[in-house]
Interface confidence: low
């Protein structure tokens, strides 16, 4: 056996578990799923960009976040065919070093950018619904655009390790070229650090913020309904809140769990070949779940708004946008028939959907 000098657990996993992740159905199923995600994602996100930018004229804070979310998804989706070919070719990389770095960074970038954008969107919803008056000065288009620039920079920063350390290299004596992190077994801090960063910065913190934001929205709306006891309850809002939180959680939790297990394998804490095989087999499947749901996010969030839905269906029927810009609503994205934090005198109306894009 080559490279058998190290005795640090990480190396031994490699020696003891030759079967890990190598199943014929993976080499067929994953490229097929990647292809479906690519087609659906490109189509859906392109329409989202067109609707928000050309039809809705990018006038609200939420529309800025949604547009950026769709753009981040498109950046990732463009590299998906490369990963489909790579998997179909049983993890051989035929595209060269430059594309290896770009494609790897794109995956990492999309994860962080989309999760950060969804987190900001949840904070924006909280401010718009719970503190509409107080937050009006803060929730401006300029703030939204600057926030997006910061998010792109942070996501870019989080993707730097992929650009630096992901490489194509030829494995001697085998005629096989791979695109992977390659490092010495003694220095296993890089992938462990990346894995834990993905867990904490790419999931745990954002999820806690999203959960807190929507919990506070839920409480505020419940309070509003209690004030208007004579009015019928609109449970749709609560279903939407549940759907948003659960959709995010269940999209990412499988990938995050297996990322964490991967870290434990690399640390040598897990030395079980069955688990190594499960992790390596499940990893591309969890990527499919996470990124497919991720690519559906702009549609999912967009369709919560009536105008978005109308323009989207209009676009599908090839009706071009009106040349004249839509009248600018003074309350922008926060438009709500009832705001829990407004004074009670304005609470005679029934609470309307609180997730309008415009």
């Amino acid at each position: 056996i080559l490279n058998s000098s190290t005795e640090d657990g990480i190396k031994r996993i490699q020696d003891d578990c030759p079967k890990a992740g190598r199943h014929n159905y993976i080499f067929v199923m994953i490229p097929t799923l990647y292809s479906i995600i690519f087609v659906v994602g490109i189509f859906g996100n392109s329409l989202v960009v067109i609707v928000i930018y050309f039809y809705m004229k990018l006038k609200t804070v939420a529309s800025v976040f949604l547009l950026n979310l769709a753009l981040a998804d498109l950046c990732f989706l463009l590299t998906l065919p490369l990963w489909a070919v790579y998997t179909a070719m049983e993890y051989r990389w035929p595209f060269g070093n430059y594309l290896c770095k770009i494609a790897s960074a794109s995956v990492s970038f999309n994860l962080y950018a989309s999760v950060f954008l969804l987190t900001c969107l949840s904070i924006d919803r909280y401010l718009a619904i719970v503190h509409p008056m107080k937050s009006r000065l803060r929730r401006t288009m300029l703030v939204a655009k600057v926030t997006c620039i910061i998010i792109w920079l942070l996501a870019g920063l989080a993707s730097l390790p992929a650009i630096i350390h992901r490489n194509v290299f030829f494995i001697e004596n085998t005629n096989i070229t791979v695109c992977a992190f390659h490092y010495e077994s003694q220095n296993s801090t890089l992938p462990i650090g990346l894995g834990l960063t993905k867990n904490i910065l790419g999931f745990l913190f954002p999820f806690l913020i999203i959960l807190t934001s929507y919990t506070l929205i839920w409480k505020a709306l419940k309070k509003a309904y209690e004030i208007q006891k004579n009015k019928p309850r609109n449970d749709d809002i609560f279903k939407i809140i549940m759907a948003i939180v659960l959709f995010f959680f269940f999209s990412w939790i499988p990938h995050q769990i297996f990322t964490f297990l991967d870290v434990l394998i690399q640390l040598g804490i897990i030395r079980d070949c069955r688990i190594a095989d499960i992790v390596d087999t499940a990893m591309p499947i969890t990527i499919c779940i996470a990124y497919f749901n991720n690519c559906l996010n702009p549609l999912f969030y967009g369709f919560l708004g009536k105008k978005f839905k109308r323009y989207f269906l209009q676009l599908l029927k090839y009706i071009p946008p009106k040349a004249k810009s839509h009248s600018n609503l003074s309350t922008k994205m926060s438009t709500l028939s009832y705001r829990p934090s407004d004074n009670v005198s304005s609470s005679t109306k029934k609470p309307a959907p609180c997730f309008e894009v415009e």
């Epitope: 990480i10 996993i13 490699q14 030759p18 079967k19 049983e90 004596n173 085998t174 390596d280």
Partner: nanobody, 121 residues
Framework: QVQLQESGGGLVQAGGSLRLSCAAS???????MGWYRQAPGKEREFVAG???????NYADSVKGRFTISRDNAKNTVYLQMNSLKPEDTAVYYC????????????????WGQGTQVTVSS
């Protein structure tokens, strides 16, 4: 650990055919399998490889003449060599190799003892 044993080598005239077999002591289902050769005074070189699925690849010098195949049930890999040339004379080695498709990429290989193939002109 997988032990590999090559067989089927021998002396053959130019233009003739040979079929090499590589029998493994354990399951080869999840290994990439390959054939390599080493001519006297030369470095060991790649001849042909077959993936976990059915992906095959060949050295340019043998393309169209050699065919690699595998029988996972019998834990055996074959190399069908047609239109043999004197320059194909070498010791042919069978190899089983693997690496993780994840962030850790360690490569290792199991080698057979080799079988001599001599092509006379």
């Amino acid at each position: 650990q997988v032990q590999l044993q090559e067989s089927g080598g021998g002396l053959v005239q130019a233009g003739g055919s040979l079929r090499l077999s590589c029998a493994a002591s354990g399951s080869i289902s999840y290994y990439r399998m390959g054939w390599y050769r080493q001519a006297p005074g030369k470095e060991r070189e790649f001849v042909a490889g077959i993936g976990v699925g059915t992906t095959t690849n060949y050295a340019d010098s043998v393309k169209g003449r050699f065919t690699i195949s595998r029988d996972n049930a019998k834990n055996t890999v074959y190399l069908q060599m047609n239109s043999l040339k004197p320059e194909d004379t070498a010791v042919y080695y069978c190899a089983a190799y693997n690496y993780f498709p994840r962030s850790i990429v360690y490569y290792y290989v199991y080698w057979g003892q080799g079988t001599q193939v001599t092509v006379s002109s």
